[in-house]
Every structure is written in structure tokens, then in C-alpha cells.
């Protein structure tokens, strides 16, 4: 008789999940020699241990602590780039500006980027059919808890001027319910962080509005100011030109506003 299996509303575990995590770990340590002390098999074992045999709506930050410990990494605290709803451009930026880091440029973020995973209570199986959706099923699912945990730690580590890239094409440029709005903003440490600088990325070619005046940006400013952190905001009118100028800052066209 086939075992009854919980059907969740979200997509199942990414195919080849164990192989992908292990391969990414090996790649990361090859690319970042300073992380060569990391034993990738132990990392996978700790990752697996966080969710295997556990109810996928009952995951806690504590479950991920062994993985967090193994993935401990020091990034320059004044070179942190946060992002919300504009991941690709943020990653293109740090690919060029090599001394800045998004969460996905760290080992743990790199391992899990774009992946989905969950297990089942009391069995060692990975569920490739479905996983809980944050809204429709439960918020304490393996993926959400992972990103909440690593995002909190990443924000806590930040210092001096912290940058955040925001998507100016969204109806809510700053969304209180995003990981940035619900986790990272509240875990920046006022005793370490002097300023949060928002870069609002414009989508339309002819969009010359000052999106720093958007009500949601004002809301972000208010939250940040109440936390005794200064706030500044810049419009990035031409993201393509912005990236080009990061690559070639001496280009004559890069002195004008981007």
C-alpha cells in the first residue's frame, strides 16, 4: 500500500539537490581559496540534517545552527550589498565590483541560491514532489527559515555604509514583507552601521522621476532613522550604463548622472 504523502502547494525539492549542493560547495572552495578549510561533505551532512526527517512546517533557526557554524565566513563588513526584488542586477554588480558582496556571494548563500528543498516527518526521504509554500502552507518551512537565518546573520555583520539595491519598477519599491524589509532592515546594528544607502533602480528608459521620493522609500527612511541609522538614497536611471561605468569608471560618459 503506497504511503500517504502530504501534498504541499509549492514546487518540490530541486532535482539533483544533494549533488548540486555538494558541487556548489566544491566550486565555491575552488573559487575562494580562503574557504578551503571547509569540508564539503560535512557541509552537506549539516545541510541535510537541518531538514531531513523533520516536519517541513516545523523548521527552526536552531536546526540550521550546525550548518551556520560550518559556513562561518568573514566578509568585509563595510562592503555589503543588500537587495530586494532585483537579484540579477545586484549579482551583475558584484561580479564587476569584486570587493563588494551580496549574500549569494558567501558560501551559504551560494549553496542555496535558487534552490528549493524539504523533507518529510519521520522518513529520511527528500520530497521532490512538493514543498510548503510560505503563504499557502506555512512560514516555518526549510527554505524560508534558511534564508531568514542567513539574512539575519548577514545583516548583523554589516558595518559603516551598507548599500541596498531596490527595484524601482515594483509597485512597492520598499516592501516590508520582503526579506530585506522584514529581516535585514531590523538586524542592521546601529552601533556598527552609520548609513544605509538605497540605490533605486529605474526600469523605463524615459523614467526621470525621483523615485527616492516614493512613499515606500519614505517609509524605509522612517524605519531606518528610528533605528538611529542615517539614510541616503540615489536614483539609478540607467542600470545598463551604471554597470558599464562600474566596469570602466574612467569613461568620459560616466561623469554625468546614471
Amino acid at each position: 500500500v503506497p504511503r500517504w504523502r502530504q501534498q504541499w502547494s509549492g514546487p518540490g525539492t530541486t532535482k539533483r539537490f544533494p549533488e548540486t549542493v555538494l558541487a556548489r560547495c566544491v566550486k565555491y572552495t575552488e573559487i575562494h581559496p580562503e574557504m578551503r578549510h571547509v569540508d564539503c561533505q560535512s557541509v552537506w551532512d549539516a545541510f541535510k540534517g537541518a531538514f531531513i526527517s523533520k516536519h517541513p512546517c516545523n523548521i527552526t533557526e536552531e536546526d540550521y545552527q550546525p550548518l551556520m557554524k560550518l559556513g562561518t565566513q568573514t566578509v568585509p563588513c563595510n562592503k555589503i550589498l543588500l537587495w530586494s526584488r532585483i537579484k540579477d542586477l545586484a549579482h551583475q554588480f558584484t561580479q564587476v565590483q569584486r570587493d563588494m558582496f551580496t549574500l549569494e556571494d558567501t558560501l551559504l548563500g551560494y549553496l542555496a541560491d535558487d534552490l528549493t528543498w524539504c523533507g518529510e516527518f519521520n522518513t529520511s526521504k527528500i520530497n521532490y514532489q512538493s514543498c510548503p509554500d510560505w503563504r499557502k502552507d506555512c512560514s516555518n518551512n526549510p527554505v524560508s527559515v534558511f534564508w531568514k537565518t542567513v539574512s539575519r546573520r548577514f545583516a548583523e555583520a554589516a558595518c559603516d555604509v551598507v548599500h541596498v539595491m531596490l527595484n524601482g519598477s515594483r509597485s512597492k519599491i520598499f516592501d516590508k514583507n520582503s526579506t530585506f524589509g522584514s529581516v535585514e532592515v531590523h538586524n542592521l546594528q546601529p552601533e556598527k552601521v552609520q548609513t544605509l544607502e538605497a540605490w533605486v533602480i529605474h526600469g523605463g528608459r524615459e523614467d526621470s522621476r525621483d523615485l527616492c521620493q516614493d512613499p515606500t522609500i519614505k517609509e524605509l527612511e522612517s524605519i531606518i532613522s528610528k533605528r538611529n541609522i542615517q539614510f541616503s538614497c540615489k536614483n539609478i536611471y540607467r542600470p545598463d550604463k551604471f554597470l558599464q561605468c562600474v566596469k570602466n569608471p574612467e569613461d568620459s560618459s560616466c561623469t554625468s548622472e546614471i
Partner: antibody, heavy 120, light 107 residues
Framework: QVQLVQSGAEVKKPGASVKVSCKVS????????MNWVRQHPGKGLEWMGW????????DVAQKFQGRVTMTADTSTDTAYMELSSLRSEDTAVYYC?????????????WGQGTTVTVSS | DIQMTQSPSSLSASVGDRVTITCQAS??????VDWYQQKPGKAPKLLIY???NRYTGVPSRFSGSGSGTDFTFTISSLQPEDIATYYC?????????FGGGTKVEIK
């Protein structure tokens, strides 16, 4: 088993570009960083850079920056290395190479090499 | 960039001889040194990784030692099929760098 098969020999004129391909089998291209190494005739080995095919991220050795473009086509499990503004000193054998799981960070897997000759 | 100084650049030895090649790194590379064998017209072949670990299928006559800046590669009993050029390489720091090679010939 893991195999890296490179494109055939090329003869190019100075100033032209060359694009060398490296098709992999026995594993998924995105599961490993692909490195490129070149060797001048009768000389030593020179690392050119790597690409992470999963994200398209690259790291190119200083001396090749601005001239080398590394790309990957995950749909065909093929990595590419393009070298532009060719000069006679670029005459060499170009290899793709990757690490393995039980080889530290050495390269147990190599392509057979692609000979590029730059001559007017 | 880290320089890998390999010596000798060539050597001639008899079958059965013990052959030793050294490699010196210009700065500490821990044990992140690999040794390759290359025969004419062929791609290099990994023999030793992380200074002293023999790669799968490599005969036991090949060995390596060292850490920090000084490394040694040894063929305990030279065989005719060992005629090749041998390279050390450091994989500790980007960019990876290779030694200049040692050409091994039979007397």
C-alpha cells in the same frame, strides 16, 4: 566517465579572434568550474582563468583581461574561451581543465588541447 | 603572483634510478601543490595533489612531499614510460601558477 573534448586546430591572422570550445560528458557542466590553461610551443603551462558555468561568473588572469571572454552553454554542456586581438605570441595549445572530487584542487581532467596558430 | 621555481630544468637518469625534482614557491602555499606529467603532444596528467597525495591509479613509485614553500617530487625507480616533462603547480592562490617544468630523459 568524465571527458572534455575540444574543438579542432585553428589558424588565425593577427588582430583576429579565436573561439575554442570544450564539450563535456560524464558530468553536468554546471557542477564544476571550468579552467583554461595555455602552453606555448615547447614551453610551460599558463593559467588563463575560470568560469563558473552555472552563473557565468569568470575570473581572468590579469594579463588576459580585456582580451579573453569565457562563456558556457549549459544546454549543450559546452564551455567556450574566446581570445581577441590575436598576436603571434598567442600561438599556443589551449586546454580546458577541471578539478575532481578526490584530487584536492589539482586538475585530473583535461581536454585534448586546441592548437591555435597566429600567422600573417 | 606566486612564482614557482622548479629545478632542475632537465635531467638524465638510468632506468631504476631515484629521481628527485624540487619546487620552491615565492610565498607560503600551505600544502596546495600539485605535480603533473606531460608527454609530447598530450595534455598534462595529474600525479600528485595537495603535495603528497597520489591521484587515483598513479603508480606508487611517484611521491611528493613538502609544505609552505619547499616541495619535492620523487620517482623512486625510473621506468622507460616515465620519460616526460614534469610540472609543479600551486593551487593555493589565484592566479594558479606553474613551475617551468623538468624534462626527464633516460641515459
Amino acid at each position: 566517465q568524465v571527458q572534455l573534448v575540444q574543438s579542432g586546430a585553428e589558424v588565425k591572422k593577427p588582430g583576429a579572434s579565436v573561439k575554442v570550445s570544450c564539450k563535456v560528458s560524464g558530468y553536468t557542466l554546471t557542477d564544476s568550474v571550468m579552467n583554461w590553461v595555455r602552453q606555448h610551443p615547447g614551453k610551460g603551462l599558463e593559467w588563463m582563468g575560470w568560469i563558473d558555468p552555472e552563473y557565468g561568473r569568470t575570473d581572468v588572469a590579469q594579463k588576459f583581461q580585456g582580451r579573453v571572454t569565457m562563456t558556457a552553454d549549459t544546454s549543450t554542456d559546452t564551455a567556450y574561451m574566446e581570445l581577441s586581438s590575436l598576436r603571434s605570441e598567442d600561438t599556443a595549445v589551449y586546454y580546458c581543465a577541471r578539478t575532481g572530487y578526490n584530487s584536492g584542487y589539482g586538475f585530473p581532467y583535461w581536454g585534448q588541447g586546441t592548437t591555435v596558430t597566429v600567422s600573417s | 603572483d606566486i612564482q614557482m621555481t622548479q629545478s632542475p630544468s632537465s635531467l638524465s637518469a638510468s632506468v631504476g634510478d631515484r629521481v628527485t625534482i624540487t619546487c620552491q614557491a615565492s610565498q607560503n602555499v600551505d600544502s596546495d601543490v600539485d605535480w603533473y606529467q606531460q608527454k609530447p603532444g598530450k595534455a598534462p596528467k595529474l600525479l600528485i595533489y595537495k603535495a603528497s597525495n597520489r591521484y587515483t591509479g598513479v603508480p606508487s613509485r611517484f611521491s611528493g612531499s613538502g609544505s609552505g614553500t619547499d616541495f619535492t617530487f620523487t620517482i623512486s625507480s625510473l621506468q622507460p614510460e616515465d620519460i616526460a616533462t614534469y610540472y609543479c603547480a600551486q593551487s593555493n592562490t589565484h592566479p594558479r601558477t606553474f613551475g617551468g617544468g623538468t624534462k626527464v630523459e633516460i641515459k
